[in-house]
Interface confidence: medium
């Protein structure tokens, strides 16, 4: 496997087994300092493929509250404000990392978990299957 | 310090300082078993607010590769395939958790970090500011 040059100040770990257990500092560094806090907050209403946000809550997970987008329509909103079914509203999905306590209720032991979340919706041209 | 009721099978941690360091198992549990692997893969081209995917790579971060969406146009693609500047293509952003090696190059020591990523684009009606 790959050998990473080791910083002499690294914590020692004799456990070379996979699955790997690592030390993680929970003083979370937030890199989003210069972002507009409003961000995408009103796009869900102004989009031609608008969506509703549903709360997905799990107190044994971090982050415990994740907002899931559900497209409001099968079609997209046209210039007249009506739903055009010649186009499709589809969810944009992303795989994200979350932390889950493992074993349950242990304050100092976690497992990384991947979950798929719908972040918002976009309007796409449908794939039309022509029958010969 | 705070005493949290402890599962008897928990790893011990005497460090009651803040920031806290915990053990994290990197054998990732993937909850996305019944999802279509194609997912949003072709939406970036079929969307009325199409986007390009840029590879953001950082060997000191886990995951080391993150794909960032950049909207192709300021406007949106209309029914004729032209860019309509009366509408706006905007990125849908999401805050995600990543692990960053800390100190750098340490294979077993990380810090949690939050970063903001653009997942895809959606077409929105612009906010028009009328001058009195």
């Amino acid at each position: 496997g790959i050998t990473i040059p080791r910083n002499p100040g690294c914590p020692n770990s004799e456990d070379k087994n996979f699955p790997r257990t690592v030390m993680v500092n929970l003083n979370i560094h937030n890199r989003n300092t210069n972002t507009n806090p409003k961000r995408s907050s009103d796009y869900y209403n102004r989009s031609t493929s608008p969506w509703n946000l549903h709360r997905n809550e799990d107190p044994e997970r971090y982050p415990s509250v994740i907002w899931e987008a559900k497209c409001r329509h099968l079609g997209c909103i046209n210039a007249d404000g009506n739903v055009d079914y010649h186009m499709n509203s589809v969810p944009i999905q992303q795989e994200i990392l979350v932390l889950r306590r493992e074993p349950p209720h242990c304050p100092n032991s976690f497992r990384l978990e991947k979950i798929l979340v719908s972040v918002g919706c976009t309007c796409v041209t449908p794939i039309v299957h022509h029958v010969a | 310090g705070i005493t949290i009721p402890r599962n008897p099978g928990c790893p011990n941690s005497e460090d009651k300082n803040f920031p806290r360091t915990v053990m994290v198992n990197l054998n990732i549990h993937n909850r996305n078993t019944n999802t279509n692997p194609k997912r949003s893969s072709d939406y970036y081209n079929r969307s009325t607010s199409p986007w390009n995917l840029h590879r953001n790579e950082d060997p000191e971060r886990y995951p080391s590769v993150i794909w960032e969406a950049k909207c192709r146009h300021l406007g949106c693609i209309n029914a004729d395939g032209n860019v309509d500047y009366h509408m706006n293509s905007v990125p849908i952003q999401q805050e995600i958790l990543v692990l960053r090696r800390e100190p750098p190059h340490c294979p077993n020591s990380f810090r949690l970090e939050k970063i903001l990523v653009s997942v895809g684009c959606t077409c929105v009606t612009p906010i028009v500011h009328h001058v009195a």
């Epitope: 003083n27 971090y62 415990s64 932390l99 | 806290r20």
Partner: nanobody
Framework: QVQLVESGGGLVQPGGSLRLSCTAS????????MYWVRQAPGKGLEWVAN????????YYVDSVKGRFTISRDNARNSLYLQMISLRAEDTAVYYC????????????WGQGTLVTVSS
């Protein structure tokens, strides 16, 4: 969307009492441990007290034991901190925070309520 709103702070003389309240919205209040933390002028954040989801267990930093009482009303989505025998060193901005599984890590804070203990 998660919101925490504190109230009840003010100016009080040493030995006096105050009751802080925190109203929560945007999450299922009864599913989470809740915390009070404080920040004295020019100092870092200090954990003060926390209470389990059902109110069955409470924890306090040593300096407030016997003087502060944390409680909650899940039906009203509310958290409280009753403070008696207040001292000058209790002067701080008090925040309520939603407990996460990460020990002593809080994603969501209120705007805080200032408690000033002075004669």
């Amino acid at each position: 969307q998660v919101q925490l709103v504190e109230s009840g702070g003010g100016l009080v003389q040493p030995g006096g009492s105050l009751r802080l309240s925190c109203t929560a919205s945007g999450f299922t209040f009864s599913n989470y441990s809740m915390y009070w933390v404080r920040q004295a002028p020019g100092k870092g954040l200090e954990w003060v007290a926390n209470i389990k989801q059902d109110g069955s267990e409470e924890y306090y930093v040593d300096s407030v034991k016997g003087r502060f009482t944390i409680s909650r009303d899940n039906a009203r989505n509310s958290l409280y901190l009753q403070m008696i025998s207040l001292r000058a060193e209790d002067t701080a901005v008090y925040y309520c925070a939603k407990g996460e599984i990460l020990p002593l890590y809080f994603d969501h804070w209120g705007q805080g309520t200032l408690v000033t203990v002075s004669s």
